[in-house]
């Protein structure tokens, strides 16, 4: 049956036993500066292209043992759930992976800005359709990163992020705290924003929208055919990273402010449980929660 | 995220450190009154100094971002600093990132060009 | 353009080994592993399992798994499919074919097991 | 004995439309998107007609169309040519494998 979070992002009219768009997504790439990740898991085999592109800091400790599946954790699940054949939202996208994040989830903002840069070099030799730019990673607000996020998306690319597991105001963390991007806060289930150990999602006014991001079934790289289950503001954001790649496919002349104000329209609104957030965030923090078009919308997003 | 929102640095540290001399013989000193402003990471385990990006003004022409990396090495140099360019930027932002001593800062940010310097630090999976 | 090309036919007896080759090209190797499919005579197709491109990783089919070892060397893009203990039932045209979409198929490798 | 059901056979005239099922179970073609069908002339590889269960390769002839429903997917075939004359295998993924049908033969008449 249909993963909770498929059926929730999914306009009433297509649940059925099972969710499946066709072709969702097919003339947008979906860029994703993450770890490295197994590009022919047979969730995702033939829908990334991984770009030579490598920019991450050694891991940490003397005695980490680098072992395959673990560095590839984190990119191909999100991978998988961005473009995955049977448990992703945007079946029809095509990716394309950057790995800024080490074997232990841990990058530099220099080296996520010059991965951004390789994008924006990528656009000008060789322009495509609609680019969608997953940045499922948080570090401390930085003026340069949400700087080169800021052009990136004045040149007209559409930049996703997750909000942080932090537990705390959005503002204090880039990229989420860049106004240009698309920045995703995690609710579960329940509609309740997710609580992850002692922290949880982010919230506060640089928060966009939340989507599903608690128990997502995914791309495992412990083998080829595995599935697993994670949680994050990550897994959050690129269900939105999905669901902009389907808009952008069946509306490609859409700009960010467009596509902000159909993402926010097209929310399931006001379902999140508000006492979560602290008394004094509550007002600031957007309640909604991401969903596609509904079926008025078929012949463009189910053809 | 959230567009219509002011600028806001949060607990962001922001140092300014003010354009003294014009030391060096700079062949194009900054403009009277300017000031870059070197930043740097409020969460201090995240830090990672000895990497700084520093950006240049927008305008600033690959070429320019080149020659001034170039003359931060050769004053670096002078004062028995060894410095590392590690990558140039263009196509984003002007600027280029340099692996160098915090010493050199206040002398970085006196180069021509120089808008503000950020130093390095850590982002992470979510 | 995208091309599996297979070694030749083999004539092997009751007990011995195969090791069939196919070698890859026309695309990005690592974005797909390689499935070998095997169909014996007047029958139908049955998939024999996979290997990775990018880490070496496999997946047998249960029915052949103990006597089935498949290999890469990324530096000629060939895979190896080796068949051990042969039996006469193993006898078979052989395909390797891209991924587990299958895709693109070789040319596809007789082999014969006869006393 | 094969994972997946098909008919033998099949058969059909110029122009008509056929359909060929393949029944499986909520552990493959029922629990999974990825249905796949191939087309199989005799001494020659087979060759791939609809991938997840209804989209065409490049190069497929729309008269080629697949889909699923339950435990069950369809390929049909429309306005059938002579050339249309072979073996079709459909296939789906498993928790940990592949599965192949075992086969329908179609005749051209």
């Known amino acids: 049956s249909i993963p909770w979070n498929l059926e929730r992002i999914t306009p009433p009219r297509y649940r059925a036993d099972e969710y499946q768009p066709p072709d969702g997504g097919s003339l947008v790439e979906v860029y994703l500066l993450d770890t490295s990740i197994q590009s022919d898991h047979r969730e995702i085999e033939g829908r990334v292209m991984v770009t030579d592109f490598e920019n991450v800091p050694e891991e940490d400790g003397t005695r980490f043992h680098r072992q395959a599946s673990k560095c590839d954790s984190h990119g191909t699940h999100l991978a998988g759930v961005v473009s995955g054949r049977d448990a992703g939202v945007a079946k029809g996208a095509s990716m394309r992976s950057l790995r800024v994040l080490n074997c232990q989830g841990k990058g530099t903002v220099s080296g996520t800005l010059i991965g951004l840069e390789f994008i924006r070099k990528s656009q000008l030799v060789q322009p495509v359709g609609p680019l969608v730019v997953l940045l499922p990673l948080a570090g401390g607000y930085s003026r340069v990163l949400n700087a080169a996020c800021q052009r990136l998306a004045r040149a007209g690319v559409v930049l996703v992020t997750a909000a942080g597991n932090f537990r705390d105001d959005a503002c204090l963390y880039s990229p989420a705290s860049a106004p240009e991007v698309i920045t995703v806060g995690a609710t579960n289930a329940q509609d309740q924003p997710v609580t992850l150990g002692t922290l949880g999602t982010n919230f506060g006014r640089c928060v966009d929208l939340f989507a599903p991001g608690e128990d997502i079934i995914g791309a495992s790289s412990d083998c080829s055919t595995c599935f697993v289950s994670q949680s994050g503001t990550s897994q959050a954001a690129a269900h939105v990273a999905g669901i902009a790649a389907m808009m952008l496919s069946a509306e490609p002349e859409l700009t960010l402010a467009e596509l902000r104000q159909r993402l926010i329209h097209f929310s399931a609104k006001d379902v999140i449980n508000e006492a979560w957030f602290p008394e004094d965030q509550r007002v600031l923090t957007p309640n909604l929660v991401a969903a596609l078009p509904p079926s008025t919308h078929e012949n463009l997003y189910f053809q | 995220g959230a567009m219509g929102q002011e600028d806001e640095d949060g607990d962001y540290e922001e140092l300014v450190l003010a354009l003294r001399s014009e030391e060096d013989g700079l062949a194009e000193a900054p403009e009277h009154g300017t000031t870059a402003t070197f930043h740097r990471c409020a969460k201090d385990p995240w830090r990672l100094p000895g990497t700084y990006v520093v950006v240049l003004k927008e305008e600033t022409h690959l070429s320019q971002s080149e020659r001034t990396a170039r003359r931060l090495q050769a004053q670096a140099a002078r004062r028995g600093y060894l410095t590392k360019i590690l990558h140039v930027f263009h196509g984003l932002l002007p600027g280029f990132l340099v692996k160098m001593s915090g010493d050199l800062l206040e002398l970085a940010l006196k180069l021509p060009h120089v808008d503000y310097i950020e130093e390095d630090s850590s982002v992470f999976a979510q | 353009q995208i091309q599996l090309v297979q070694s030749g036919a083999e004539v092997k007896k009751p007990g011995a080994s195969v090791k069939v080759s196919c070698k890859a090209s026309g695309y990005t190797l690592t974005s797909y592993g390689i499935s070998w499919v095997r169909q014996a005579p007047g029958q139908g197709l049955e998939w024999m399992g996979w290997?990775?491109?990018?880490?070496?990783?496999?997946n047998y089919a249960q029915k052949v798994q103990g006597r089935v070892t498949m290999t890469t060397d990324t530096s000629t893009s060939t895979v190896y499919m080796e068949l051990r203990s042969l039996r006469s039932d193993d006898t078979a045209v052989y395909f390797c074919?891209?991924?587990?979409?299958?895709?693109?198929w070789g040319q596809g490798t007789t082999v014969t097991v006869s006393s | 004995q094969s994972a997946l059901t098909q008919p033998a056979s099949v058969s059909g005239s110029p122009g008509q439309s056929i359909t060929i099922s393949c029944t499986g179970t909520?552990?493959?073609?029922?629990?999974?998107?990825?249905v796949s069908w191939y087309q199989q002339h005799p001494g020659k590889p087979p060759k791939l007609m609809i991938y997840?269960?209804?989209n065409r390769p490049s190069g497929v002839s729309n008269r080629f169309s697949g889909s699923k429903s339950g435990n069950t997917a369809s390929l049909t075939i429309s306005g059938l040519q002579a050339e249309d004359e072979a073996d079709y295998f459909c296939?789906?993924?498993?928790?940990?494998?592949?599965?192949f049908g075992g086969g329908t033969k179609l005749a051209v008449l």
């Open positions: 074919a891209r991924g587990y979409g299958m895709d693109v």
């Open positions: 997840e269960v209804s």
């Open positions: 296939s789906s993924y498993t928790s940990t494998s592949m599965v």
């Open positions: 290997i990775s491109f990018y880490n070496g990783n496999t």
């Open positions: 909520s552990s493959d073609v029922g629990g999974y998107n990825s």
